[in-house]
């Protein structure tokens, strides 16, 4: 049994880190493999993660961590029974992938504006709460070429767009993702998308 692609890990900078890797052949990850992780300092407790399959040869493990802080560094040992397949280390604060924003809502009650709001995925006591910026993807359900990205570089999780910039009588979808500038993170996953119907009509005199 052999590792084809070594584990790479990302952290939500709160309590969960996710490691993914690929094996040399089809593997029942949960039955055959264990990922052990330990905080690098004195004789910290060793924790065990049971991986799940992620495609035929892929494995993924969700490591639960006790309140990730900037000083934390972990050793990682990938075992197949008594055989050590791979050994590495992981510093969560240097490999941050933010949690995805949630509760994306579209407000169309103001006639000429579409207001999108969503929730910051972090509590205010987490440094990332005030460090996130967002990208909002809006697309036409009937024409995937009619897609746009709005970068939201201010802190408030809202976006206002003129309804007139969207085609009338068309259903649109939106989704949002986040990244943190000070930590030079990767982008989060996209939020679940939300759908709305653009019923905006130009005023009569502009037709």
């Amino acid at each position: 049994m052999k590792v084809l692609q070594e584990p790479t890990c990302v952290s939500d900078y709160m309590s969960i880190s996710t490691c993914e890797w690929k094996m040399g052949g089809p593997t029942n990850c949960s039955a055959e493999l264990r990922l052990l992780y330990q905080l690098v300092f004195q004789s910290s407790e060793t924790h065990t993660c049971v991986p799940e399959n992620n495609g035929g040869v892929g494995c993924v493990c969700h490591l639960l961590m006790d309140d990730v802080v900037s000083m934390d560094n972990y050793t990682l040992d990938l075992w197949a029974g008594q055989q050590l397949l791979w050994k590495g280390s992981f510093k969560p604060s240097e490999h941050v992938k933010p949690r995805a924003p949630g509760n994306l809502t579209v407000h169309t009650n103001v006639s000429d504006t579409v207001l999108l709001t969503w929730s910051n995925p972090y509590p205010p006591d987490n440094y990332l709460y005030n460090d996130l910026t967002y990208a909002v993807n809006i697309w036409n359900e009937n024409d995937l070429a009619d897609s746009r990205i709005h970068n939201v570089t201010y802190l408030k999780p809202t976006l206002r767009i003129p309804a007139s910039t969207l085609k009338s009588g068309i259903s649109y979808r939106a989704r949002v993702r986040a990244w943190a500038q000070h930590y030079n993170t990767t982008w989060s996953e996209w939020s679940p998308s939300t759908k709305w119907y653009n019923s905006y009509r130009e005023p009569f005199e502009q037709r």
Partner: antibody
Framework: QVQLQESGGGLVQPGGSLRLSCAAS????????LTWVRQAPGKGLEWVST????????LYADSVKDRFTISRDNAKNTLYLQMNSLKPEDTAVYYC??????????????WGQGTTVTVSS | DIQMTQSPSSLSASLGDRVTITCQAS??????LAWYQQKSGQAPKLLIY???RLQTGVPSRFSGSGSGTSFTLTISGLETEDLATYYC?????????FGQGTKLEIK
């Protein structure tokens, strides 16, 4: 506003024990890692111990490991430091400190006023 | 353990002077560095975190710079109330380690 109030310091003989407390208010106590830092007379600052928010992880300086125990009671909003087998070199002002953010555990935005521990025969 | 070496250990400067204190780490700590001010008989006070981010309420004459192994705390125009000892602290890895301190006196 955040308040941290240490107590429990005093004069103790070498080999003796003390239990320091730090009563906290003004923030969600259970969300933050908390730390003890000490300062010997006329000397610099020294990290002593940190306990993570949920209490499952405790970390110690080599100079106090196996003698000191950090703990917390999230219901009482109180941090503790049980100090056993005390040595003269443990003589210091002991501060409890709270970080600015829950995941920046060393950027201490709030400090108590300190409690003095003197180890002498 | 990461060693933090501060220099100078003490310095004397005049009001209005630009004052620079440096902190050298024994290995790279990225930008995981904080600066503290401690006045006589008081608890320390956070000035700078993340190497360069000014803590709320700290006068703008204080600034921090550097990354990797070399860091600087600058006071752009010294004032009487800045009489204190200044400490750097690395928050990159356990154990947390402070610099030995720089005692700032007013000429």
């Amino acid at each position: 506003q955040v308040q941290l109030q240490e107590s429990g310091g005093g004069l103790v003989q070498p080999g003796g024990s003390l239990r320091l407390s730090c009563a906290a208010s003004g923030f969600t106590f259970s969300s933050y890692s908390l730390t003890w830092v000490r300062q010997a007379p006329g000397k610099g600052l020294e990290w002593v111990s940190t306990i993570k928010a949920r209490g499952g992880t405790t970390l110690y300086a080599d100079s106090v490991k196996d003698r000191f125990t950090i703990s917390r009671d999230n219901a009482k909003n109180t941090l503790y430091l049980q100090m056993n087998s005390l040595k003269p070199e443990d003589t210091a002002v002991y501060y409890c400190a709270k970080p600015l953010y829950s995941n920046l555990a060393g950027d201490f935005g709030s400090w108590g006023q300190g409690t003095t521990v003197t180890v002498s025969s | 353990d990461i060693q933090m070496t501060q220099s100078p250990s003490s310095l004397s400067a005049s009001l209005g002077d630009r004052v620079t204190i440096t902190c050298q780490a024994s290995q790279s700590i990225s930008s995981y560095l904080a600066w503290y001010q401690q006045k006589s008989g008081q608890a320390p006070k956070l000035l700078i975190y993340g190497g360069s981010r000014l803590q709320t309420g700290v006068p703008s004459r204080f600034s921090g710079s550097g990354s990797g192994t070399s860091f600087t705390l600058t006071i752009s125009g010294l004032e009487t109330e800045d009489l204190a000892t200044y400490y750097c602290l690395q928050v990159y890895s356990w154990p947390l380690t402070f610099g030995q301190g720089t005692k700032l006196e007013i000429k």
